[in-house]
Each structure stands twice: as structure tokens, then as C-alpha cells.
């Protein structure tokens, strides 16, 4: 359905055109030049690499690239004083160590400045004591080791697998539940998928290989010294003390060789259940402490990392619209490694280089988008998202009365299985259009569209011939456009098969082997999946902004409000009780969500009928559909997350990458059994319940006639 | 009990060849890169060469990558290595090793070794 | 390639003596290996990625360094511990040891 009338270019300048210039080839190139050596943010070599994509997009044909920087805090394991765990004997002799480093992979063995495993933000410290075996730190793992277990964790160092949800929620949890400190491990039965080989012979997880990850719990932040505001020259920034979402305890990461040498001699109380054991040939006991024999000795932990004030640059690049130039698609994804980024993230930058390429084609044969487009490389991402939040800080208020749509464009594989996208339901009909105008890149569906094969695959569980697309979360660049500032946003990337790989994320994630040859040799040779990719954010990109009008359907906004009703009724609904004495009710909730589907399904029948060629007209439809997303925005933002506002979809707060509905009525429903003051549990409930039907009823009437 | 023994070792004239083998026990042998490590008499160890799981991936001494050969057979549980062209500076005591850690070469199993004597 | 220094060659050691024997790299290595060798046996694994203890080992010796230097240090020397002891690098291709020091008992 684009349109070419409005910025007069003949008719070849069409989305086709765009699509048929993205090349698997360039891809390929692109990602070997972008992971030859490390680019960890707030180091020369990623200053390096942005002054050279701000050169090439500028030779690509875009009108503007500039540099954004900012000086933000960021840690760094201390060169001469390495960070390691240590098991100790009574006389205190440290009788095993855990490595240093992950063992180069083949070919990068003469590669300086890979920065050693470390959890980024742990404070210093060397605490020592017994050992308990938390499982994967979830909320869930420590009500069973507290409440049914009756295990004290306070004062003991606890030891977390990888996986499952955000590893600063596991640490959060830890800190609550009074540890001393946190070792976080890869295990097998996560990172090593079964009849696959370790890398260099295959994608799976080495011994030696160890997850690196910042542990913050910034709950949308940005840089942790100037919440709220641009980290820029004058900046006034808080002491440490009253940072943001820093951890208070030390938190290191190993891998499975050096969690064997834990876990083996673990005593204590046995498993729960078999849903806390893993992989390893260990007894997986949850202690406190060692068995028997070892029950003297003691686990030793040496953080000796420094926290930082550095200066990032993200790269803006802008294509200039004919039409509505005041009127923001964005692109972005982040540039900083924090190795060698194989996939993460430059599977992603790569995609984003070929679609400004493909864009700076098109304009430099006398094409432009109707609206402007902008492209971000965005730094310090894998430090809390510090990049993109410090540019949208800085430039909220045009982002909020200019911003369409922002596309997420970090690691365009996690898997070479289907697609998976994640968006706002305003962008449902926008993607399942353009999928069914896409070939399938997947073996067996020669000659079939994208949409079929990722149906066929991942089907929806609601909507029978349709495929799954999922709730927004965090723990990417698209947080503060979204959960903040209320910017419609979507993010799509080809995944792995989650029925028969239960592991979590892909097995190399942020460590040393995520490189050009693990995505070469073993993940996409033929680049296909990445055009794939390039071709559904490119698209998605296109559409936005060059249709006439935007491609949103605020009718799917009101399926999911309706769902998203019902869920959080039938929660509540496991205390009858409760809600008769309290008075709760969802009423008001569910009236809202009536009135907004009627007024969605009226604005959409004049969607259809309203006279095109009337400029006026046009943009006042266009400006009803970009700030519906908008509506959704409580200023005041959620109970302790204030830059969290969106009301109808936050980050979990026991999972920062989950997303979940009606995150204010959820929060103030979870685990209320065990409050002290139910009478003020309750109240809380029933304010969050006014709170989203006011929110939903006022996003309602943006929809309404104007007059 | 994990184990590795050696054979076919022996005396071989200049230029001539022979092939050592490894039978492994006791552990999955397929999932270990395996190694060959020689011991010249009253002389160090060196390093020979390394296979992968399934012997699609091998690496060697540069000096001996064209005479010597490292080759596996999983079904059988054996690691072989093909002398070609011998001098008298490859008699040597010969180990097979098992190496822990994959493609880094850390052994942590050693056969008793077999001897390979090149003269005429 | 990482060629791999040690010292001592040989040390003649009285019992109950503190040993050190050193490995010099030529360039930087991630980790060290140290192997026990007696006299017509085959090698032993000693020390594991630079400081920690292969299975059986006993807790005099110990195991330090980083980048091109390291250390195998025997704390009280005992007559069982008369053997060649070599080092090991795996940080690349060609995997090299060390000459080798030799342990002699008084």
C-alpha cells in the first residue's frame, strides 16, 4: 500500500525498489568489518568505529550525520588486579581459582583488549563465606528457598545459574534476600544445546566461555548519576551514593568448568525438585555450604572493579522528508561490544549499514521518504542502555511531539528457526502486510511468503493462521522511546526453535566465541536469515515512512486492551474474597475498554472514507494515530519506576526483558497474601485499577471526532 | 577407568612409515578432541598434533604438517597417527592425550606411550 | 609461536626445602599448565589454568603468575616430589612446553 503521490518520484522508488538494493553480500562484509577487533563502549577503538559509520552513512547519501556525546558511568574490571573466586582452606590458602579469561577462540589469540569476563557495575569487595545454590535467582526461587526450604541466605555468598530472566533481577533478588555476594554461571543445561558441538565446532557454550553483563536495575534511568536528564557538559551529576540502580553487593560471572569446581562439593539440603538441578555430573544440593569433608572451607570472592564517568558516542544519521519533515522514524541499534559482538550487536549494525545504504540509493536518485528518518548507532548499550536513553533525554521534546515510530535494530539473529517480533498491537497489521510480501528465506518453503512459514512455525496462541508476535519488554534500545516516551516501537529478529531449544538466549551470548565465524560457520553462511531481517526492519522503516497514511490499527489496541482485561480480572480473581471485602472492582476497567474498542472501530471507518488529498484532514488523522501511543503515558509513571509510564505495558519487574500488561494493577496484585496491611494491599489495587480505566478511557477519546 | 593405550610403534628405516594407534575406555571418546605428544629420549615434550570431536577439524606442528597425518574413528574408539617420510629426529616415545578442554590442548589423561625408533 | 622458558633446568633440593621453579613466555598467555614427569612414566597433569591443582595433587604445591611469567612453587619438598616438571601453554597454536626443570633430591 505505499504511496508514491506525495513526494512526486516516479513510480520505480517504491518500497520494491528499496527491498531489491539490500544484498545479502554487503551484509557479510559489513559484519566482518564491524568484529575484528572489540569494540567495548568508552574505548578508542569504538570512537574508531563510529567516526567511520558517521563517515560511511554521510557517503551513503544521508543528509546529516552528526556525533552525540555524553559522559556517563561505566565499569571496567581493573587491568592489574584481576577479578576471580576462590575456594579457601581453614588456614585461609586459596585452593582453587577460578580463570581469568576465556581461552582466545582460533584466530584471535594476538587480539589485545578483550576485556576478562566481569558483571559491569559490582561494586569492590571481597566477601567470604558459605555457599547456597539459588537456581536462577528468580522472585519464585527465593519464596521456595525461604518459605519452604526455610534456607537463610543472609550472610551467604549465592551461586546463580544464567538464564530464565535479566541477570540484575537475580541480583536484586539476591540483595533482598541478604547475600553477601553473587556468582552467576552459565550451566549446561542452558547454554549447551544437546548433539551440538562448543565452539570453534559448533554454536555451543565451551567450558571456559562466561556470560559478561551489566547487573544494574535502572528501571529506565539512563546513566545512573543524571536520571532524568541528558548526562552533557554541564551536567550535574549525584554522588555514588544516590546512583541509580546500582548493586550493593559484589556479583561475578563463570563458566561451567569453574561452577563444577563450586557445585561438587555442595552440601547441605538437597534440590527441591528436579526443575533446580542442571547439567552438570554435581549433586546440584542448595547447601548452605559444603558437605563433610569440605565443610570447612569457604568460597572467596576478589572484585576489584571501578566504576567510572567515560564519554560515549552514539551516531545520528538523518534522511530528510519531503513532506512531513517534522515527523520522526527512527532506526536504531547499538554499536558497543562487549567482545568481538558476532551477533550481538553487529549482526544487527551490519543490517542497519545495508538499510541506510539502500535508503541512500534511493535519495541520491532523486528519492525521499514523505517523513524524516533517522538512524542511530547507539553506544553503551550493554551498560544499561545508557546511549539511546541520554539522546532521548536530551531531545524528549521533539521526540514526544515529533516521534512516528522508532524500529529496535540490535542482533538480527538468536537462531536461524523463524522470525520473532515483539511490537505495539498499532503495528500488528503493518508487519503480518509486510510479511505476507516477503519470501521465506526457510528451508522447505521455497516459493512461500515469510508470514506463512513464521505462522506455520510459531503459530499465535489466541488467532488460528496467524503468527505469535509479543508484548514489548526491555533490556534493548527501544525502552526509553517506549516504556518512556511513548513512541509506538517494534523490534524483529530470526530466532531458534523454543520448543526443542530450551536454552537461554543463544549459547555464545557475550562471551569471546560471539564472532564473524560463529555466524559464518554455523548460524547464517549464506547471509539469507540477515536479509530476511533487513528486508522486515527496512520495511517496517519504509512503510512508516513513506505511506500516506500511517500504517497503524488502533483496532488491535483494543483486542489486546480486552485481553489484557481479562488476564488481570482472572488474577484478581484468585481472592474472592479479598475483593468482596475490599470492594474491588474491575467496572470501570472494563467500561473503559468497551469505549475503546467503539471508538477505535469509529475512527477506523473514517479511516477508511476520509478525503486523502486534504493535507489538513490527513494530518490530523495521521497526528490521532501517533499519539495514541502517546495517550498511554502516565507522567507520574508507575509505583518506584517513574520512567516506566506507559500504563499498559512495563518490563516485569521480576524480569527486565518480559514485558507485562497492566503492569500497575499486576504489581500491586502480586504476592498481596503475604502483605502486613491488606486493608492497604487492597487500596493499592484499587487505585492502579482507576488508574489504567482513566488511562485507557482518556487514550479513548484521542480517538474521538475532534469536534 | 578412563584409560588410553598406545601400539604400533617400533623400528623404521629413513623414509619409511607407520601408523600409531590409540585405543581409548572407559570415557565418551567422541566427546574429547584427542592429541599425540612425542618425548625424543633424554629430550622435553612436544606437541605432535590435536583432532577434533569428529575429525573434521586437525592441527599440527607446522614442521610435521606434511609427513604426519591425525585421524579418529569414533565407532572404534581409536585415535591414529600416519608417519610418512621419517627421519631419525622423529624417534621419539609417543603419547596419546586426552585434551580437557577442547581445541586448547590441556591434557589431563596420558597413555604409557609408544616408542617409534627411525634408523637404518 | 610462544616459546616457553623455565628455570632452574635442574635443582638438587633438600627435603622439607621451598622450591620455585619459573616459566617465562615469550608473549602473553591467558593460563599456564604445569605437568609431572618420573622417570619412565608418562606425564601427569599438575597445576590447571595457572594456580589450581590437578586431582591428587598435594597442598604444598601452588601455581601463580599471569601474562609472561608464572610460578610452580613447592612449599616443603617432599622425596616423592623427585620428577621433571614441565610447563604448558594453550593460548595458540603451536601448543609448546617448557624445556623442563628437573628435581633432584639431596
Known amino acids: 500500500k505505499s504511496s508514491n503521490e506525495a513526494t512526486n518520484i516516479t513510480p520505480k522508488h517504491n518500497m520494491k525498489a528499496f527491498l531489491d538494493e539490500l544484498k545479502a553480500e554487503n551484509i557479510k562484509k559489513f559484519l566482518y568489518n564491524f568484529t575484528q577487533i572489540p569494540h567495548l563502549a568508552g574505548t578508542e577503538q569504538n570512537f574508531q568505529l563510529a567516526k567511520q559509520i558517521q563517515s560511511q552513512w554521510k557517503e551513503f547519501g544521508l543528509d546529516s550525520v552528526e556525533l552525540a556525546h555524553y559522559d556517563v558511568l561505566l565499569s571496567y574490571p581493573n587491568k592489574t588486579h584481576p577479578n576471580y573466586i576462590s575456594i579457601i582452606n581453614e588456614d585461609g590458602n586459596e585452593i582453587f581459582n577460578t580463570s581469568l579469561f576465556e581461552p582466545p577462540p582460533p584466530g584471535y589469540e594476538n587480539v589485545s583488549d578483550i576485556v576478562p569476563p566481569f558483571s559491569a557495575f559490582s561494586p569492590q569487595g571481597m566477601p567470604e563465606g558459605d555457599l547456597v545454590y539459588v537456581n536462577y535467582a528468580r522472585t519464585e526461587d527465593f519464596f521456595k528457598l525461604e518459605r519452604d526450604m526455610k534456607i537463610n541466605c543472609s550472610g551467604k555468598i549465592v551461586i546463580a545459574r544464567y538464564g530464565k530472566v535479566f541477570r540484575g533481577n537475580k541480583v536484586k533478588n539476591a540483595q533482598l534476600a541478604g547475600a553477601k555476594g553473587v556468582i552467576l554461571y552459565s550451566d549446561p543445561a542452558d547454554y549447551f544445546a544437546p548433539g551440538v558441538k562448543s565452539y570453534p565446532d559448533g554454536w555451543n557454550l565451551p567450558g571456559g566461555g562466561v556470560q559478561r553483563g551489566n547487573i544494574l536495575n535502572l528501571n529506565g534511568a539512563g546513566d545512573p548519576l543524571t536520571p532524568g536528564y541528558p548526562a552533557n557538559e554541564y551536567a550535574y551529576r549525584r554522588g555514588i551514593a544516590e546512583a541509580v540502580g546500582l548493586p550493593s553487593i559484589p556479583v561475578h560471572p563463570i563458566g561451567y568448568y569453574d561452577a563444577q569446581k563450586l557445585l561438587e562439593k555442595m552440601g547441605g539440603s538437597a534440590p527441591p525438585d528436579s526443575s533446580w538441578r542442571g547439567s552438570l555430573k554435581v549433586p546440584y544440593n542448595v547447601g548452605p555450604g559444603f558437605t563433610g569433608n569440605f565443610s570447612t572451607q569457604k568460597v572467596k570472592m576478589h572484585i576489584h572493579s571501578t566504576n567510572e564517568v567515560t564519554r560515549i558516542y552514539n551516531v545520528i544519521g538523518t534522511l530528510r522528508g519531503a513532506v512531513e519533515p517534522d515527523r520522526y522514524v527512527i532506526l536504531g541499534g547499538h554499536r558497543d561490544s562487549w567482545v568481538f559482538g558476532g551477533i550481538d550487536p553487529q549482526s544487527g549494525a551490519a543490517v542497519v549499514h545495508e538499510i541506510v545504504r539502500s535508503f541512500g540509493t534511493l535519495k541520491k536518485e532523486g528519492w525521499r521518504p514523505r517523513r524524516t528518518i533517522l538512524f542511530a548507532s547507539w553506544d553503551a548499550e550493554e551498560f544499561g542502555l545508557l546511549g539511546s536513553t541520554e539522546w532521548a533525554e536530551e531531545n524528549s521534546r521533539l521526540l514526544q511531539e515529533r516521534g512516528v515510530a522508532y524500529i529496535n535494530a540490535d542482533s538480527s539473529i538468536e537462531g536461524n528457526y523463524t522470525l520473532r517480533v515483539d511490537c505495539t498491537p498499532l503495528m500488528y497489521s503493518l508487519v503480518h502486510n509486510l510479511t505476507k510480501e516477503l519470501k521465506s528465506p526457510d528451508e522447505g518453503f521455497e516459493g512461500k511468503s515469510l508470514y506463512e512459514s513464521w505462522t506455520k512455525k510459531s503459530p499465535s496462541p489466541e488467532f488460528s493462521g496467524m503468527p505469535r508476535i509479543s508484548k514489548l519488554g526491555s533490556g534493548n534500545d527501544f525502552e526509553v522511546f517506549f516504556q518512556r516516551l511513548g513512541i509506538a516501537s517494534g523490534r524483529a529478529r530470526y530466532t531458534k526453535n523454543w520448543e526443542t531449544n530450551k536454552f537461554s538466549g543463544y549459547p555464545l551470548y557475550h562471551s569471546v566465541y560471539e564472532t564473524y565465524e560463529l555466524v559464518e560457520k554455523f548460524y547464517d553462511p549464506m547471509f539469507k536469515y540477515h536479509l530476511t531481517v533487513a528486508q522486515v526492519r527496512g520495511g517496517m522503516v519504509f512503510e512508516l515512512a513513506n505511506s500516506i497514511v500511517l500504517p497503524f490499527d488502533c483496532r488491535d489496541y483494543a483486542v489486546v486492551l480486552r485481553k489484557y482485561a481479562d488476564k488481570i480480572y482472572s488474577i484478581s480473581m484468585k481472592h474472592p474474597q479479598e475483593m468482596k471485602t475490599y470492594s474491588v472492582s474491575f467496572d470501570s476497567l472494563f467500561s473503559a475498554v468497551k469505549n475503546f474498542t467503539e471508538i477505535a472501530s469509529k475512527f477506523s471507518e473514517r479511516l477508511q472514507d476520509f478525503d486523502k488529498s486534504n493535507p489538513i484532514v490527513l494530518r490530523m488523522m495521521n497526528d490521532q494515530l501517533m499519539f495514541l501511543e502517546r495517550a498511554f503515558i502516565d507522567p507520574l509513571g508507575l509505583p518506584d519506576r517513574p520512567f516506566y509510564r506507559h500504563v499498559i505495558y512495563a518490563p516485569s519487574s521480576h524480569n527486565k526483558y518480559a514485558g507485562e500488561s497492566f503492569p500497575g494493577i499486576y504489581d500491586a496484585l502480586f504476592d498481596i497474601e503475604s502483605k502486613v496491611d491488606p486493608s492497604k494491599a487492597w487500596g493499592e489495587v484499587k487505585r492502579q485499577i482507576y488508574v489504567a480505566a482513566f488511562t485507557v478511557q482518556a487514550a479513548a477519546e484521542t480517538l474521538s471526532e475532534v469536534a | 577407568e578412563v584409560q588410553l593405550v598406545e601400539s604400533g610403534g617400533g623400528l623404521v628405516q629413513p623414509g619409511g612409515s607407520l601408523r600409531l594407534s590409540c585405543a581409548a575406555s572407559?570415557?565418551?571418546?567422541?566427546?574429547?578432541?584427542m592429541a599425540w605428544v612425542r618425548q625424543a629420549p633424554g629430550k622435553g615434550l612436544e606437541w605432535v598434533a590435536n583432532?577434533?570431536?569428529?575429525?573434521?577439524?586437525?592441527y599440527y606442528l607446522d614442521s610435521l604438517k606434511s609427513r604426519f597425518t591425525i585421524s579418529r574413528d569414533n565407532a572404534k574408539n581409536s585415535l591414529y597417527l600416519q608417519m610418512n617420510s621419517l627421519r631419525a629426529e622423529d624417534t621419539a616415545v609417543y603419547y596419546c592425550?586426552?585434551?580437557?578442554?577442547?581445541?586448547?590442548?590441556?591434557?589431563?589423561?596420558w597413555g604409557q606411550g609408544t616408542t617409534v625408533t627411525v634408523s637404518s | 609461536e610462544i616459546v616457553l622458558t623455565q628455570s632452574p633446568d635442574f635443582q638438587s633440593v633438600t627435603p622439607k626445602e621451598k622450591v620455585t621453579i619459573t616459566c617465562s613466555a615469550s608473549?602473553?598467555?591467558?593460563?599456564m599448565y604445569w605437568y609431572q614427569q618420573k622417570p619412565d612414566q608418562s606425564p601427569k597433569p599438575w597445576i590447571y589454568?595457572?594456580?589450581n591443582l590437578a586431582s591428587g595433587v598435594p597442598s604444598r604445591f601452588s601455581g601463580s603468575g599471569s601474562g609472561t611469567d608464572f610460578t610452580l612453587t613447592i612449599n616443603s619438598l617432599e622425596a616423592e616430589d623427585a620428577a621433571t616438571y614441565y610447563c604448558?601453554?594453550?593460548?595458540?597454536?603451536?601448543?609448546?612446553f617448557g624445556q623442563g626443570t628437573k628435581l633432584e633430591i639431596k
Open positions: 572407559g570415557f565418551t571418546f567422541s566427546d574429547y578432541y
Open positions: 604448558q601453554q594453550y593460548h595458540s597454536y603451536p601448543l609448546t
Open positions: 589454568r595457572t594456580s
Open positions: 583432532i577434533n570431536y569428529d575429525g573434521s577439524s586437525t
Open positions: 592425550a586426552r585434551d580437557l578442554d577442547g581445541y586448547y590442548g590441556y591434557f589431563d589423561v
Open positions: 608473549s602473553s598467555v591467558s593460563y
